[in-house]
Structure formats: structure tokens, C-alpha cells
């Protein structure tokens, strides 16, 4: 029973984690304009892995995609790669783990096969979680470096009275979503690996021993006994994370100039 619970919980936790990784990857708020010195701003900048956006005080939001591949910083490309690898591994892991679940019967699949699949999916979840955590951490490190660099050159003089105030960026919501999601996927993977140990059949065959009782002969032959673990009835694995990332393709979100009541 405990093994099934551990496996089921590991699956659910990983599912939530991977949903979170997908959401974080799609989110636009990987870095947001630092408002420390100016909490109320007319133009609020924020950036994601795929596009950068501006929310105006007027209420309009406009996003612009990174339409170049070669012109992007290598670090950003690396973060994208890590997040995509994390998603792909996690998705494969989920697929494998569905068939590995003890509560799901598929033909005459041996417990040993289920144990192997559980271990495989567990490792995949662990690597997926690590990829997400690594990706988010690399981006966070990049932000910290840039933050202090732009603080040092907060005002780059352009001669006379003209000055360019550099926009400083700080951690966006996607980073925290990514860290938590990566952590959950990692935990789910560890739980799957633990469940695998319990699923692996222990072949403890005892030699047959004959007992001769007076009067009649009874042969007691214990052997090949497998401990049967009951399986949980809860097969509804709800996807709880609703990654509020906007994935629409439109670049601008404006009301029409004459939107009547």
C-alpha cells in the first residue's frame, strides 16, 4: 500500500512540477523592471525567454518577440535549451510513469517491468527538475550580474544635460515558478525512485521441507511467496497548476479606439 501511495504521490507531484516548468517557460515575467527607486512608473518593462513587453500606465500592453536567433545572448539560448530539455524529459517521464503506475493494469505486465519503468521515469523527473532549476538559476545569475553592472553605470552621461537612465531588471514571477516547479519535479522523481525499490520483486524461494506426521503424510511446501500490496483507488490525478502564462500569438492587446459600452 505504501509503495503505491509513494508512486502515485510521486506521479502527481511530478505532474504539477512539469506543468509549472511549462508555465514558467511560457511566462513573460522572467525579469521585471526594478521599481525600487520609482514604485509608480508610466512605462513598466518586463522580459521573458521568447519576448519582451511593456505595460503602459494607460493600461495598454505591447510585446515584441525576439525574432532573431543568432543575435540573442548565449546565456539566454542556454536557458531556453535547459527549459525545453526539462519539459521534454518530464513529458516522456510522465508518459512512462503512467504505464508504470501499480494501480493501472496493462495486459500481463510483470512487476519487475513496472519497477524498471518507475525507476526510469523517476530518473527522468530528477533530470527534468535539475534542468529547470539550472535554467532558472543561470538566468537569475545573469540578472544579478546585469543589475549590479547597470547600478554602477546608472547614469551614462551623453554630454550636457542629457542622460540615459538604464532600465534595471530584477527577478520576475517566472523565476520563482520555475524554482518551485523544478523542485517539485525533483521531489516527484525521488519519490518514484523510492517507490521502485518497493515494487521490485524479492525472489525468496525456500527449499521444500517434508514433515512426516504419524498417521498421515502432509507435505508443506512454502516458496515463491510474494507480498501482495493493495493498490489505491484514487486514480484521478488532478492537474492543479494553472500556469497563467499567456501564450496567445498576438503582439498587442489594445481595446479598440471606439469601444462602446
Amino acid at each position: 500500500m505504501a509503495v503505491t501511495a509513494c508512486q502515485g504521490l510521486g506521479f502527481v507531484v511530478s505532474l504539477i512540477g512539469i506543468a509549472g516548468i511549462i508555465a514558467a517557460t511560457c511566462m513573460d515575467q522572467w525579469s521585471t523592471q526594478d521599481l525600487y527607486n520609482n514604485p509608480v512608473t508610466a512605462v513598466f518593462n518586463y522580459q521573458g525567454l521568447w519576448r519582451s513587453c511593456v505595460r503602459e500606465s494607460s493600461g495598454f500592453t505591447e510585446c515584441r518577440g525576439y525574432f532573431t536567433l543568432l543575435g540573442l545572448p548565449a546565456m539566454l539560448q542556454a536557458v531556453r535549451a535547459l527549459m525545453i530539455v526539462g519539459i521534454v524529459l518530464g513529458a516522456i517521464g510522465l508518459l512512462v510513469s503512467i504505464f508504470a503506475l501499480k494501480c493501472i493494469r496493462i495486459g500481463s505486465m510483470e512487476d519487475s517491468a513496472k519497477a524498471n519503468m518507475t525507476l526510469t521515469s523517476g530518473i527522468m523527473f530528477i533530470v527534468s527538475g535539475l534542468c529547470a532549476i539550472a535554467g532558472v538559476s543561470v538566468f537569475a545569475n545573469m540578472l544579478v550580474t546585469n543589475f549590479w553592472m547597470s547600478t554602477a553605470n546608472m547614469y551614462t552621461g551623453m554630454g550636457g544635460m542629457v542622460q540615459t537612465v538604464q532600465t534595471r531588471y530584477t527577478f520576475g514571477a517566472a523565476l520563482f515558478v520555475g524554482w518551485v516547479a523544478g523542485g517539485l519535479t525533483l521531489i516527484g522523481g525521488v519519490m518514484m525512485c523510492i517507490a521502485c525499490r518497493g515494487l521490485a520483486p524479492e525472489e525468496t524461494n525456500y527449499k521444500a521441507v517434508s514433515y512426516h506426521a504419524s498417521g498421515h503424510s502432509v507435505a508443506y511446501k512454502p516458496g515463491g511467496f510474494k507480498a501482495s500490496t493493495g493498490f489505491g483507488s484514487n486514480t484521478k490525478n488532478k492537474k492543479i497548476y494553472d500556469g497563467g502564462a499567456r501564450t496567445e500569438d498576438e503582439v498587442q492587446s489594445y481595446p479598440s479606439k471606439h469601444d462602446y459600452v
Epitope: Q33, N38, V40, T41, A42, V43, F44, N45, Y46, Q47, S52, C53, V54, E56, S57, S58, G59, F60, E62, C63, R64, V162, Q163, T164, V165, T167, Y254, P255, K257, H258, D259, Y260, V261
Partner: antibody
């Protein structure tokens, strides 16, 4: 079509208060910020502040923080600006304007002349 | 606060000729998120409220004739009227829409020579 109609001209004594109204029509009032701008006779434009009709959130130019109070009445789609402790320097035409994309003001009221004179 | 400085203060141009008004900002008006410049141009005729001509430094508002062109980026902006018409006589203002408080240039008075 979009229209912003302001209240009529006012003549006030120094130290008094005045409330200028701006009635909006032809668009969804609660979707757009309403700005207030003043123009002293023969002078340029000066931004006072703006108010969002949906939550009455305001952004005020620090220069006017003790002078202007911005409010809205959603039921009548009207924005108000109250000017207190009037002085002769407050004599100006006061405009309301809707905020469009790019933080630009696309539709303007006809203006309200406030004259402060003893 | 961002200071907007227009030049010249007044300008006299012949009908059909090109008119150019400059606007210099004390700070960059370029938003990194969408690479747009938050600079707006208005036209004000005597006894009338200002009229929006151009926003985002170069985007013409609906109904604005295409003889009006906005250009520039960062701190330096220009409004160009390619062929001056009699109805273009007015005062022109530039406005910072990048940061609070929104500020206007002192205005440029355009007249016919």
C-alpha cells in the same frame, strides 16, 4: 463618437475652491484613464494628473498634490477635478483628456477657464 | 522630472515648403521592452484644445494627414511637415509619455512666411 464635455467657465475669489467636471461619452468610460492638463494664458501645457475610472486610482504631479483632487462618478461617466486654495496663478484653462496608447492623450475636452480674481 | 526642450520657439515657412520642429529630451524615452519611444506630438490652434498628431514618436493618429511625419529615437526627435498648408498654422508641442510626471515642451509657433 468619443466626446469629453467639460463644465462652464468659473470665476473664483482667492482662497476658494472650484470643481471642474468632464463628462465622457462614446466609449467605455471605465477602460481608460482620464488626464487633466492646464494651460495658463499665453503659456504652454502642464500635466496635473490622471485618474482611472474603474478603481479611482490616481497619479498626480507632485507639484499639484496639495492643489488638485481627482475623482470619478462611474454612474454618470464623469471625471472631476477639485482645485483648492485658489490663487491668481491658478488662472488657466483646464482640460480633461483620455489616455491612449503610448501614454498619449487622444481626445480632449473643450477646456474650462477658471479665473481667480479678487 | 524629464525636461523637454523644443526648437525653434517660432518658425515661419512658406506655403508648400517643408517645416521642421525639433524636440530634445533630458532623458531617453526609449522603452527597452518594446523598443518604442514614448514621445508624442500635438497641434494646438488658437482657442482650441490640443490635437493628437503622433504617438510613439512616429505613429500617426487616425485621420492625421500623411504630410506630418515623426522621427527620432532616444533623446532627439523631429516633427516634419512635408508641404505646409494654411491650416497647419498652430502651436506644436512634444510630450514625454515615458515617465511621471508627463511633461511638455514649451511649444513651437508655426506661421506662414
Amino acid at each position: 463618437q468619443v466626446q469629453l464635455v467639460q463644465s462652464g467657465a468659473e470665476v473664483k475669489k482667492p482662497g476658494a475652491s472650484v470643481k471642474v467636471s468632464c463628462k465622457a461619452s462614446g466609449y467605455s468610460f471605465t477602460n481608460y484613464w482620464v488626464n487633466w492638463v492646464r494651460q495658463a494664458p499665453g503659456q504652454g501645457l502642464e500635466w496635473i494628473g490622471m485618474v482611472h475610472p474603474s478603481g479611482s486610482e490616481t497619479r498626480l504631479n507632485q507639484q499639484f498634490k496639495d492643489k488638485a483632487t481627482l475623482t470619478v462618478d462611474k454612474s454618470t461617466s464623469t471625471a472631476y477635478m477639485e482645485l483648492s486654495s485658489l490663487r491668481s496663478e491658478d488662472t488657466a484653462v483646464y482640460y480633461c483628456a483620455r489616455v491612449w496608447s503610448g501614454n498619449a492623450f487622444d481626445y480632449w475636452g473643450q477646456g474650462t477657464l477658471v479665473t481667480v480674481s479678487s | 522630472d524629464i525636461v523637454m526642450t523644443q526648437s525653434p520657439d517660432s518658425l515661419a515657412v512658406s506655403l508648400g515648403e517643408r517645416a521642421t520642429i525639433n524636440c530634445l529630451s533630458s532623458q531617453s524615452l526609449l522603452a527597452s521592452g518594446n523598443q518604442r519611444n514614448y514621445l508624442t506630438w500635438y497641434q494646438q490652434k488658437p482657442g482650441q484644445p490640443p490635437k493628437l498628431l503622433i504617438y510613439w514618436a512616429s505613429t500617426r493618429d487616425s485621420g492625421v494627414p500623411d504630410r506630418f511625419t515623426g522621427s527620432g529615437s532616444g533623446v532627439d526627435f523631429t516633427l516634419t511637415i512635408s508641404s505646409l498648408q494654411a491650416e497647419d498654422v498652430a502651436v506644436y508641442y512634444c510630450q514625454n509619455g515615458f515617465s511621471f510626471p508627463f511633461t511638455f515642451g514649451q511649444g513651437t509657433k508655426l506661421e506662414i512666411k
